[in-house]
């Protein structure tokens, strides 16, 4: 992590990747411990708070704008040397973002994929973004990068995660860059959770009263199963959003949680997944599937069991 | 002590321009960005942007964009904001306040708030 | 733009209570959240910054809590003088939205 003998590492926290407005921290360390340092901005666009100032632990840079982009590095004081300064450090980028209208994220062939399967997160704009980033929440290394292909007036770029296994989990963002500002990237695209299923043991899925049930009737999923998952999730064939309620212990010794459909009128094919608090994007094999089927006229469709959970809602802890 | 004082309350008619002040004591007014906050009637608080007093660089919430132009007089230590094309909506109480320093900073101190009232 | 959501919008509770009230970020904040409490005709005054720090002169019957999307501003034991609107605002990139706010009033 130190890099060479005379070279101090610098590193930014809480993120390298930084929105407008936002404040960072830079830290160089060198030969075991934070002394004085020298930072430089490696471009051309002048930052005049770094010249000739000597830094001491960690310089905060904020509230950042689209300046302040760039590759930074720093140098350690070294008093007995010739130059009384150490050897430059590592390269730091620091990207900032909310400088163009955010792309879009997709995956194919979507975001709930089962262990050990590769999937492909698609960005794309309008905007012509000459490199794609990607960003997984939560993690501090850098964003990967691509360069955007343009087709039909559309930038875009694929990229591929894969074999998934936990740790790749999670909530995803793409920012784009346009070409000459590499570093200034847009807003980021709206968050996309990837979940990864076929970690534990599959839970059952039952209906009450049935699943056959009269047009009007009320409906209620149950999700149980012995495993103590902190939530389930109620998925409905066809349909984008998933349903999520926190289980509950019962007296027989299962975990459970009851999903009121409301009345009835167009049946489904619903599937239940069980997950832990800790890693709420890492969910269990599916139950066996549950048609629900509805008998009598039906004056409308049934209404949607999930209310579209919050944007980034899948991949976080249920309160 | 850091102080912010801000102008008096003001009455305006829809679509005229007001400029408001936020007068600095006690601090090196060049050091720390300033910023605007509104408060209408009974509502809660939105930021509205804010001005380097050193660069001169301002960014405003995207809401305000058209609205506001903040500006600053480094040698009066005082900070501005015109508010242009006003409407009844524009009726609220604004504020200033001065991001303090460090990693994860709050606002510190805020000005006392100007009145602005927008009536025909 | 990181929204923030700031429950419950009112709340009574009698002097003596413990109380509790939290802000929900639409994504994570890396603890960049101050608490303001706000009297009428007043302006806010800073209660907590970085989630967790308290501002100075602020009685230690305020606490904040929280990292990544949810914090939570907790009074101990309230006084009479607690009796106000609380806000939470977030600073991880501009425009540094509020929470709705929640006015605490007296049973």
């Known amino acids: 992590l130190m890099g060479g003998q005379d070279k101090p590492f610098l590193s930014a926290r809480p993120s390298t990747v930084v929105p407008r407005g936002g404040h960072v921290a830079l830290q160089c360390h060198y030969r075991r411990g934070f002394n004085n340092f020298m930072l430089y901005k490696e471009d051309r666009s002048h930052v005049p708070i770094f010249h000739g100032r000597i830094f001491q632990e960690s310089f905060i840079m904020g509230p950042v704008t689209p300046a302040h982009a760039g590759t930074y590095r720093c140098r350690g004081s070294r008093p007995h040397s010739l130059t009384g300064w150490s050897a430059p450090s590592n390269p730091l980028v620091i990207m900032v973002t909310g400088n163009h209208r955010k792309p879009s994220l997709l995956a194919h062939p979507g975001p709930l994929l089962k262990s050990g399967e590769t999937v492909i997160l698609q960005c794309w704009s309008d905007v012509m973004f000459e490199h794609f980033f990607l960003h997984r929440e939560g993690i501090s290394e850098d964003p990967s990068r691509l360069v955007g292909q343009i087709h039909d007036g559309v930038s875009k770029a694929n990229f591929s995660i894969g074999p998934l296994m936990p740790v790749l989990a999670g909530t995803y963002r793409c920012y784009g860059s346009v070409p000459h500002s590499p570093y200034q990237l847009s807003a980021p695209s709206d968050p996309l959770d990837i979940v990864i299923t076929g970690l534990y043991e599959k839970p059952s899925l039952s209906a009450q009263p049935g699943p056959t049930v009269q047009a009007g009737e009320n409906v209620t999923l149950s999700c149980s199963s012995w495993s103590s998952y902190d939530i389930y999730h109620l998925s409905r064939e066809g349909e984008a959003h998933e349903r999520r309620l926190r289980a509950v212990p019962k007296v027989n010794r299962t975990f459970q949680a009851d999903f009121p459909l409301g009345p009835a009128t167009h049946g489904g094919t619903y599937r239940c997944f069980g997950s832990f608090r800790a890693l709420p994007c890492v969910w269990s094999n599916s139950s066996d599937p549950l048609l629900v089927s509805v008998t009598g006229n039906p004056s409308s469709s049934w209404p949607s069991p999930t209310e579209p959970s919050s944007k980034s809602g899948i991949c976080r802890h249920l309160h | 002590q850091v102080q912010l004082q801000q102008s008096g309350a003001e009455v305006k008619k829809p679509g005229a321009s007001v400029k408001m002040s936020c007068k600095a004591s006690?601090?090196?007014?060049?050091?720390?960005?300033m910023h605007w906050v509104r408060q209408a009637p009974g509502q809660g608080l939105e930021w509205i942007g804010y001005?380097?007093?050193?660069?001169?660089?301002?960014e405003n919430n995207r809401k305000f964009k058209d609205k506001t132009t903040l500006t600053a007089d480094t040698s009066t230590s005082t900070a501005y904001m015109e508010l242009s094309s006003l409407r009844s909506e524009d009726t609220a109480v604004y504020y200033c306040?001065?991001?303090?320093?460090?990693?994860?900073?709050?606002?510190?101190?805020w000005g006392q708030g100007t009145t602005l009232t927008v009536s025909s | 733009d990181i929204q923030m959501t700031q429950s419950p919008s009112s709340l009574s509770a009698s002097v003596g209570d413990r109380v509790t009230i939290t802000c929900r970020a639409s994504?994570?904040?890396?603890?960049?959240l101050a608490w303001y409490q706000q009297k009428p005709g007043k302006a806010p005054q800073l209660l907590v910054y970085?989630?967790?720090n308290l501002a100075d002169g602020v009685p230690s019957r305020f606490s904040g809590s929280g990292s990544g999307t949810d914090y939570t501003l907790t009074i101990s034991s309230l006084q009479p003088e607690d009796f106000a609107t609380y806000y939470c605002?977030?600073?991880?990139?501009?425009?540094?939205?509020f929470g709705g706010g929640t006015k605490l009033e007296i049973k």
């Open positions: 006690g601090y090196t007014f060049t050091s720390y960005t």
């Open positions: 994504e994570n904040i890396y603890s960049n």
């Open positions: 306040a001065r991001l303090g320093k460090g990693l994860l900073p709050p606002f510190d101190y």
């Open positions: 605002q977030h600073f991880w990139g501009t425009p540094y939205t």
């Open positions: 001005i380097n007093p050193s660069s001169g660089y301002t």
């Open positions: 970085a989630a967790t």
